[in-house]
């Protein structure tokens, strides 16, 4: 782990810089200028598979270093290597409370492995609450609950997500941090597996207690649209889902776990360089208002409902899909106005075993997965050792082990 | 036109102090992160200061860190460089610079000489 | 910080010669790569940004190339007005360092 970047700065840590990037990265940006660009000159960032694609800020010239996108659940700001912003997020491990840091052994010393940890906060992912994260080599968090064997399909947090392997160097090394209001995972000096003459990789991601999200990359030795997918898949951005049951054709008394993923963020590619970052600022969600009122009542760009029954505020798109849909919510819901549930007790209800969870907003707005049927897209494997087995809770070089695997 | 004009140089004995400043116009001087640039008789231009468009951010050069405050005034369009505990190395021409929207410095002034002898 | 060494430090051409300035820098500064050309007396101008991106104003035989450490400006056919020296800045992290300077004269 070397030092910080870009020693010398004179900011206080955390300031916002409001800038277009490198040289520019002193000047006012473009969206508070708003003369400055043009619709012509627009051009797409990423994709947002929950509401399409979505224009962004750019000058005319294309070079903008600092680059804002809206994506419904999150904004992200993604700042060029020149921007010195970039260098205030990233997150000095090696300068960190040894007590916080732990050098992730295990991960350090395999490929395709991935291992849970218990956060010391409840991190806001898409405005849920979640306790556990899965580290894997693969330069990717995973942030689902059930493991699977397609832990890069969707809910993660991807930096970089690629094919790494760790084992390949006693210099490389999977470590995370954790000082209580921000959890960070870095990827130090990875290489690629059958790419490793190209150089190692440095990177990290942060996940922040106020639910932000950051990527920051230090060494990026290629250029990442060259890297190769047909192992491993490539990606970088956020992804979640939710899960639903439905009947098993084969089986009628079984159910059949499906994955939908409602949405995904998708950075360029070739926007990750050697010293950028990528900041995901979370957008307010319906499962934020814990009153009917602040739920109807809510001017977000989601159309929020409130259940009664559940008592939760929702879009319909969320992790809880399947309560929202077993107990009737989305009929519920329908033309009703607060006033209408005064006197419901919503202790009583149970799921409506009758309804569908295939309702028609569901196929044409989401990507399904399915779990059972699709062709396994990566192998990664689960470490059952989340605690001190696997872990060294020093900055002292790795020391080589046999890894568990345990097969999902 | 767009255009920087430096004033407040001159002759200084070494340790004391310096004001210089560089009148903008032309442009949005509030839209803009300012440089100072300097560059020693005979010698090659050496980067000294930047401060964000806002004037809340600043970044020095190792050899004038402590001793120089980059500093504007957005309502007057004017940018600032005060300079303490000066030295003889300090001596130089002194230009700002407009940080460009592409990329670089894309407006000069014509420089103002300050120069440190006892 | 990032040093940014140029080469040659001077040469001589001759009115119409393609003249090639190189400049490198200490670690990868990806594009981020300025070119100015400055004449006695006077504030240096900006040519190149970006690398390769031609200032406004900046007359057509001036370009530039390359990305990551190794950078160069070339002058298709020098003009008398060329003769200067050029200077080669990073743009990629603060301090903006400059190259030396190549100082370009006549044969």
């Known amino acids: 782990l070397s030092p910080q970047p870009g020693a010398g700065h004179d900011e206080g840590p955390g300031s916002g810089w409001a800038a277009k990037g490198t040289v520019r990265g002193w000047n006012r940006r473009a969206r508070e200028s708003p003369g400055h660009v043009s619709e012509p000159d627009r051009t797409q960032l990423s994709q947002d598979l929950g509401g399409g694609t979505l224009a962004m800020d750019t000058l005319p010239d294309n070079r903008t270093r600092v680059v804002e996108d809206n994506h419904s659940y999150y904004v992200s700001r993604l700042y060029g290597p020149s921007e010195p912003h970039s260098r205030e997020l990233w997150v000095d491990v090696a300068e960190a409370n040894r007590s916080q840091v732990k050098i992730h052994t295990i991960l350090s010393n395999t490929h395709r492995q991935a291992s849970r940890v218990v956060l010391s906060f409840d991190f806001p992912f898409y405005g849920h609450p979640l306790r556990q994260i899965t580290i894997a080599t693969g330069g990717f968090i995973f942030m689902g609950d059930v493991i699977h064997r397609m832990l890069t399909a969707t809910q993660y947090v991807a930096p970089l997500m690629a094919n790494f392997n760790p084992g390949y160097s006693d210099n490389s090394t999977v470590v995370y941090f954790d000082n209580g209001t921000v959890f960070v995972v870095q990827w130090d000096h990875v290489y690629l597996q059958g790419w490793e003459d190209k150089g190692s990789f440095t990177f990290q991601a942060a996940l922040h207690h106020d639910g932000r999200i950051v990527f920051a990359y230090k060494e990026i030795p290629m250029s990442v649209p060259e890297i190769s997918s047909s192992q491993h898949p490539v990606k970088t951005g956020l992804s979640d889902a939710f899960m639903i049951l439905n009947p098993s054709p084969d089986v009628p008394e079984s159910r059949r776990r499906s994955i939908f993923e409602y949405h995904r963020i998708e950075l360029d590619p070739s926007k990750v360089t050697s010293m950028s970052a990528v900041e995901f600022t979370p957008l307010p969600t319906c499962l934020q208002h814990r009153s009917c009122d602040a739920c109807m009542s809510s001017d977000l760009t989601f159309n929020c409902s409130w259940c009664h029954v559940l008592q939760r505020c929702s879009s319909g798109f969320d992790r809880y899909r399947q309560e929202w849909m077993d107990y009737g919510c989305a009929q519920e819901a329908e033309g009703r106005m607060c006033e209408d549930f005064q006197d419901e007790d919503h202790d009583s209800a149970s799921p409506d075993t009758s309804f569908s969870p295939y309702d028609g907003d569901l196929t044409t707005t989401s990507s399904s997965l399915f779990i059972d049927s699709l062709t396994t897209e990566d192998d990664t494997k689960l470490n059952p050792y989340a605690g001190g087995d696997g872990l060294q809770n020093n900055l002292s070089p790795k020391t080589k082990g046999t890894p568990v695997h345990l097969g999902t | 036109q767009v255009q920087l004009v430096e004033s407040g140089g001159g002759v200084v004995q070494p340790g004391r102090s310096l004001r210089l400043s560089c009148a903008a116009s032309?442009?949005?001087?509030?839209?803009?992160?300012m440089h100072w640039v300097r560059q020693a008789p005979g010698k090659g231009l050496e980067w000294v200061a930047v401060?964000?468009?806002?004037?809340?951010?600043?970044y020095y050069a190792d050899s004038v860190k402590g001793r120089f405050t980059i500093s504007r005034d957005n309502s007057k369009n004017t940018l600032y460089l005060q300079m303490n505990s000066l030295r003889a190395e300090d001596t130089a021409v002194y230009y700002c610079?407009?940080?460009?929207?592409?990329?670089?410095?894309?407006?000069w002034g014509q420089g103002t000489l300050v120069t440190v002898s006892s | 910080d990032i040093q940014m060494t140029q080469s040659p430090s001077s040469l001589s051409a001759s009115v119409g010669d393609r003249v090639t300035i190189t400049c490198r820098a200490s670690?990868?500064?990806?594009?981020?790569l300025n070119w100015y050309q400055q004449k006695p007396g006077k504030a240096p101008k900006l040519l190149i940004y970006a690398a390769s991106s031609l200032q406004s104003g900046v007359p057509s035989r001036f370009s530039g190339s390359g990305s990551g450490t190794d950078f160069t400006l070339t002058i298709s056919s020098l003009q008398p007005e060329d003769f200067a020296t050029y200077y080669c800045q990073q743009s990629y992290s603060p301090p903006y360092t400059f190259g030396q300077g190549t100082k370009v004269e006549i044969k």
């Open positions: 610079a407009r940080g460009s929207e592409g990329d670089g410095f894309d407006v």
């Open positions: 032309g442009f949005i001087f509030s839209d803009y992160g």
């Open positions: 401060i964000s468009y806002e004037g809340s951010r600043e």
């Open positions: 670690q990868t500064i990806s594009n981020y």
